[in-house]
């Protein structure tokens, strides 16, 4: 069926970057400036996304692909395809509707985004605190107190290279 349709439908021959122009006898016309078609056989070209204001252009629009935006310094992307830019806060803070706010005692945020989270309660997982928490860092849990024999030294593990929230989707 698809093959039959493509033989009958001249628009199916129009490649990405063009559109099937009904006003010109269904000839494949190039997409006008600031528009694109990412698939073949399209009857219109889509308008290119414009990265304005707090958005900045990460990838220019071409005749076959939309522009991609990211955020200016001090902001980070939110949502699919960076649909929003959200203000960065400092580590040890969280973004509320009233702006950046310091984490309360007993909570931390090791990112420039996200919430202040309660320190991990090591004892709930049968462990002990190796390193105390701060506004910027969670506590580090170690072996249970019974596992630490006299004279045994406990070494603080290195901080992870990347924390949740910093990973690209």
């Amino acid at each position: 069926f698809e093959r039959t349709r493509s033989l009958q439908d001249p628009c199916s021959n129009c490649p990405a970057g063009t559109f099937c122009d009904n006003n010109r006898n269904q000839i494949c016309s190039p997409c006008p400036p600031n528009s694109f078609s990412s698939a073949g056989g399209q009857r219109t070209c889509d308008i290119c996304r414009q990265c304005k204001g707090v958005f900045r252009t990460r990838k220019e629009c071409s005749s076959t692909s939309n522009a991609e935006c990211d955020c200016t310094p001090g902001f980070h992307c939110l949502g699919a395809g960076c649909s929003m830019c959200e203000q960065d806060c400092k580590q040890g803070q969280e973004l509320t509707k009233k702006g950046c706010k310091d984490c309360c005692f007993g909570t931390f945020n090791d990112q420039k985004r996200g919430i202040c989270r309660p320190w991990t309660n090591c004892s709930l997982d049968g462990k002990s605190v190796l390193v105390n928490g701060t506004k910027e860092r969670d506590v580090v849990c170690g072996p249970s107190p019974a596992d630490l024999s006299p004279g045994a030294s406990s070494v603080t593990p290195p901080a992870p290279a990347r924390e949740p929230g910093h990973s690209p989707q």
Epitope: L78, G79, E86, L95, T96, K97, K98, C104, T107, R113, G114, I115, P118, T120, N121, L124, D125, D138, V139, V140, C141, P160, R162, E163, P164, G165, H166, S167, P168, Q169
Partner: antibody, heavy 120, light 106 residues
Framework: QMQLVQSGAEVKKPGASVKVSCKAS????????MHWVRQAPGQGLEWMGW????????NYAQKFQGRVTITRDTSASTAYMELSSLRSEDTAVYYC?????????????WGQGTLVTVSS | SYELTQPPSVSVAPGKTARITCGGN??????VHWYQQKPGQAPVLVIY???DRPSGIPERFSGSNSGNTATLTISRVEAGDEADYYC?????????FGGGTQLTVL
């Protein structure tokens, strides 16, 4: 694409423990906190806790403290939720859910759920 | 602990507008997220940060939040919108869900 695939249904006796797994694919597991939420038959959603897959740091709802343990194996891109001292009221569908990036903590992707039945 | 209150059920005729409320003390200062759950399926995020839609969610779904009430609005309701809807917030140390609202399309 982004997927969370959970282990199969379980039937347990009261007093026993159950361990449910949640395998993440389509994204870097270390990049996002993982949560566990349960739903008893005909009831609403009830949050149980989270794990930071990077550090292993956890936070549990007060109701479950002492009975729940959330762990992870980043090499297998899998999170686990173990619930001990099971009682009939723990019969529920247990979901893992990835924390999103919105202000104020949303859960943007969910596993298909694992039915745990506690019955003598 | 923080509590969220939702009406147990809301009924609406196809093509009309459904409004589902979520009440909580000064909820307007918090970020509210909404989930849709159809029978036998996992919840799906339909609104985050009060009023933003994830990709793939129709524009018919919108949200607002001020004072002590957040609202999920579904315009031009379709039979496929029949489901349970849950609001959710983060409150200092725990994730809190509303009790859920069953939306019936008449």
């Amino acid at each position: 694409q982004m997927q969370l695939v959970q282990s199969g249904a379980e039937v347990k006796k009261p007093g026993a423990s159950v361990k449910v797994s949640c395998k993440a694919s389509g994204y870097l597991m270390q990049g996002y906190y993982m949560h566990w939420v349960r739903q008893a038959p005909g009831q609403g959603l009830e949050w149980m806790g989270w794990i930071n897959p990077n550090s292993g740091g956890t936070n549990y709802a007060q109701k479950f403290q002492g009975r729940v343990t959330i762990t992870r194996d980043t090499s297998a891109s899998t999170a686990y939720m173990e619930l001990s001292s099971l009682r009939s009221e723990d019969t529920a569908v247990y979901y893992c859910a990835r924390e999103g990036e919105a202000v104020g903590l949303d859960l943007d992707y969910w596993g298909q759920g694992t039915l745990v039945t506690v019955s003598s | 602990s923080y509590e969220l209150t939702q009406p147990p059920s809301v009924s609406v005729a196809p093509g009309k507008t459904a409004r589902i409320t979520c009440g909580g003390n000064n909820i307007g200062s918090k970020s509210v997220h909404w989930y849709q759950q159809k029978p036998g399926q996992a919840p799906v995020l339909v609104i985050y940060y009060d009023s933003d839609r994830p990709s793939g969610i129709p524009e018919r779904f919108s949200g607002s939040n001020s004072g002590n009430t957040a609202t999920l609005t579904i315009s031009r309701v379709e039979a496929g919108d029949e489901a349970d809807y849950y609001c959710q917030v983060w409150d200092s140390s725990s994730v809190v869900f509303g009790g859920g609202t069953q939306l019936t399309v008449l």
